[in-house]
């Protein structure tokens, strides 16, 4: 299963960030988004969005904190490899 592509983190504020990515139409049933403070491995927040979505606004972030975010495509119960990025609020 190919991973989503072109993960971009934009509009970063002290407590939010916009994620956007690309994928072929109907390539995935859904996407899994996983993010965490980079220093706190194992405390990830995981959420899903429908396969038709190509963006998501992360909210409730901590100011001045580095985050690692990964997105997985899901199709038929299978997960793609992750596409990842790092950003700081």
């Amino acid at each position: 299963l190919p991973a989503p592509k072109n993960l971009v983190v934009s509009e970063v504020t002290e407590d939010s960030a916009r994620l956007s990515w690309t994928a072929p139409d109907a390539a995935f049933d859904s996407f899994l988004i996983q993010y965490q403070e980079s220093e706190k491995v194992g405390e990830a927040i995981v959420l899903t969005v429908p396969g038709s979505e190509r963006s998501y606004d992360l909210t409730g972030l901590k100011p001045g904190t580095e985050y690692t975010v990964s997105i997985y495509g899901v199709k038929g119960g299978h997960r793609s490899n992750p596409l990842s990025a790092i950003f700081t609020t």
Partner: antibody, heavy 115, light 110 residues
Framework: GGSLEESGGRLVTPGTPLTLTCTVS????????MGWVRQAPGKGLESIGF?????NTYYASWAKGRFTISRTSTTVDLKITSPTTGDTATYFC???????????WGQGTLVTVSS | DVVMTQTPASVSGPVGGTVTIKCQAS??????LAWYQQKPGQPPKLLIY???TLASGVSSRFKGSGSGTEFTLTIRDLECADAATYSC????????????FGGGTEVVVE
Amino acid sequence: GGSLEESGGRLVTPGTPLTLTCTVSGIDLSTSVMGWVRQAPGKGLESIGFIYTNVNTYYASWAKGRFTISRTSTTVDLKITSPTTGDTATYFCARAVYAGAMDLWGQGTLVTVSS
Amino acid sequence: DVVMTQTPASVSGPVGGTVTIKCQASERIYSNLAWYQQKPGQPPKLLIYKASTLASGVSSRFKGSGSGTEFTLTIRDLECADAATYSCQYTSYGSGYVGTFGGGTEVVVE
């Protein structure tokens, strides 16, 4: 696609632990986020928490320590650790489709806490 | 925690008419808002997510709008079947918090 059915709701006395079970059909829990929501009689909806895996659980601040959410490959459980009369409500299990927005719900199970 | 305030508590409108329900967040939540319809004895039904995206199978008579802190659900061409309680929900969650629901608005169809 898919269905959810809650069970385990009953009359309990205050302080008696109670576990509710959500049995899942037609949903792959390994790639799904599930939630528990409750509704007291005549009141509004109240989110308790969400689970992806047994490591990835998220609780409302008021619910932390009072509830435990866990799952197997086919069920999602909600344990009420020490029920009080204020926990009397219908408890719903649901699938999250867009972050915490939930598109598939069970019919709910009624918990009554009374001495 | 983010507090969601819904107004009014109850609203009525004639068959074929339009009603509007408002939801205000205590802080900026961007577009992380959902709307539900619930009838007595039934679980909630998701109508709208991402503030304005219609859930699968939901009539286009339902329209969600807004972002930031102010959101609106508009129901046009009211039908008797629209009589229900409508609730908004902040849909984000994370470490130590879970998005909350508004108190609900009862829609009466005359």
